[in-house]
């Protein structure tokens, strides 16, 4: 008896992080024996879409002409051959940016920092959020991912770095998001250039505990006062 059909490969072009309104194509690649391809979206009625294979039948294209909130989510695909349906592909997480206004990113006490000292990157959002992402340019994955432990929404998250080394230098951006869909992100913040001077070298920086604060009355301009209790955000390394 033949074993299960190999699972197909699922990917998105130009990528899996898409700005609102931009087009994206989802590809599902199976085998030459495929007769039909099916794309399922988590928490949507299955199948989300069906497509006939493109010649030479080993893949199918699912087109999204204009990215909106409805398309963001987790996808899997399958193909059907004469002997039945394949295993599901590994999931594809399609993320939309531009769901919310851009946060602002600051370096405290300054974006010019001496090696061995401490710096905190502060990401502040216009509306209360419960997830903050810090991205370093040319890094493969989000550097830091802070999520509220109790779903308490906050206007900011702090990303402390200590001790700072040359490894920390570079361009950073941050995003904010709501926990009800971590597939929907804000516009990226304006870039922040962190410049590290000095010669102390430590190739393995160890960030300290992350802190998130509720909006304060005097020193949080235009943040509603007493809006959320201190709950802290949980740090996730990714």
């Amino acid at each position: 008896q033949a074993g299960p059909l190999p699972k197909p490969t699922l990917w998105a072009e130009p990528g899996s992080v898409i700005s609102w309104g931009n087009s994206v194509t989802i590809w599902c690649q199976g085998t030459l024996e495929a007769r039909e391809y099916r794309l399922d979206k988590e928490e949507s009625p299955a199948p989300w879409d069906r497509q006939n294979p493109l010649e030479p039948k080993n893949k199918a294209r699912f087109s999204i002409p204009s990215m909106t909130e409805d398309y963001a989510g987790r996808y899997r695909c399958y193909y059907r051959s004469p002997v039945g349906w394949s295993q599901p592909s590994d999931p594809l997480e399609l993320v939309m940016t531009g769901a919310y206004s851009k946060p602002t990113l600051s370096a405290l006490p300054s974006p010019l920092v001496t090696s061995g000292k401490s710096v905190t990157l502060l990401c502040q959002s216009r509306s209360p959020m419960d997830t903050f992402l810090l991205i370093k340019e040319r890094a493969a994955h989000p550097l830091l991912h802070l999520r509220s432990e109790h779903g308490a929404q906050q206007h900011q998250a702090e990303f402390p770095m200590s001790p700072v080394t040359s490894v920390h230098g570079g361009t950073y951006r941050c995003f904010s998001s709501h926990g009800f869909s971590h597939y929907l992100l804000s516009h990226p913040s304006d870039p922040l250039e962190l410049i590290v001077s000095g010669s102390l070298e430590d190739p393995r920086p160890s960030p300290t505990r992350s802190v998130s604060t509720a909006a304060g009355p005097e020193d949080q301009p235009l943040m509603p006062t007493g809006s959320v209790p201190h709950s802290g955000l949980r740090r996730h390394w990714e």
């Epitope: 309104g21 206004s101 946060p103 405290l108 216009r126 804000s186 020193d219």
Partner: antibody, heavy 117, light 113 residues
Framework: EVQLVQSGAEVKKPGASVKVSCKAS????????IDWVKQPPGKGLEWIGY????????SYNQKFKGRATMTVDKSTSTVYMELSSLRSEDTAVYYC??????????WGQGTTVTVSS | DIVMTQSPDSLAVSLGERATINCKSS????????????LAWYQQKPGQPPKLLIY???TRESGVPDRFAGSGSGTDFTLTISSLQAEDVAVYYC?????????FGQGTKLEIK
């Protein structure tokens, strides 16, 4: 392309109400605050208030509280501002504007409201 | 409420020359939480809505020519147009977004000399 398209000019009698609309397109409507700003003829800009389309949250300048009411229709990506008990000083161009981080990155073309007996 | 006061009320500058507009706030717009100044500048041409030029006191909005520059901190801010062009004729407004209600300066009318 982000666009905020406002309804046309209105002429109203003192004591009447006016409802101005602002239809948004080209961005994720529910995730951005929309504010309203007043500009009397030949004068400066005055902030009226905001609405957050995601949940309908509003905040008003004390000066307009009780007379300005902002609402949202998510199905048409439209925000409305109603101004009641109109008086001659309400004659102005009213702008809707999209908030970035409390400042405004996109503005509607403006709606002229004339209050005259 | 924070009061924003611009000076001068009007200004005439020759083409190619530098134009400087000042804005003073009745209280500091510098946040100690993020070391940013909560101030924006807008340009408004006749019959048009305002257009964002500068935010965070000195960050130029995308697409705005680099002859426009914002500076200052705390309560005193400046918008500088390094080399005036004919299309820069407009009224310029500063706006504080440190606290509600949001408030604007009274405007500075910039003309060609």
């Amino acid at each position: 392309e982000v666009q905020l398209v406002q309804s046309g000019a209105e002429v109203k009698k003192p004591g009447a109400s006016v409802k101005v609309s602002c239809k948004a397109s080209g961005y994720s409507f529910t995730g951005f605050y929309i504010d309203w700003v007043k500009q009397p003829p030949g004068k400066g800009l005055e902030w009226i208030g905001y609405i957050f389309p995601s949940n309908g949250e509003t905040s008003y300048n004390q000066k307009f509280k009780g007379r300005a009411t902002m609402t949202v229709d998510k199905s048409t990506s439209t925000v409305y501002m109603e101004l009641s008990s109109l008086r001659s000083e309400d004659t102005a161009v009213y702008y809707c504007a999209r908030q970035a981080f409390y400042y405004f990155d996109y503005w509607g073309q403006g709606t002229t409201v004339t209050v005259s007996s | 409420d924070i009061v924003m006061t611009q000076s001068p009320d009007s200004l005439a500058v020759s083409l190619g020359e530098r134009a400087t507009i000042n804005c003073k706030s009745s209280q500091s717009l510098l946040s100690s939480s993020n070391q940013k100044n909560y101030l924006a500048w807008y340009q408004q041409k006749p019959g048009q809505p305002p257009k964002l030029l500068i935010y965070w006191a000195s960050t130029r909005e995308s697409g705005v020519p680099d002859r426009f520059a914002g500076s200052g901190s705390g309560t005193d801010f400046t918008l500088t147009i390094s080399s005036l062009q004919a299309e820069d004729v407009a009224v310029y407004y500063c706006q504080q977004y440190y606290s509600y209600p949001l408030t604007f300066g009274q405007g500075t009318k910039l003309e060609i000399k």
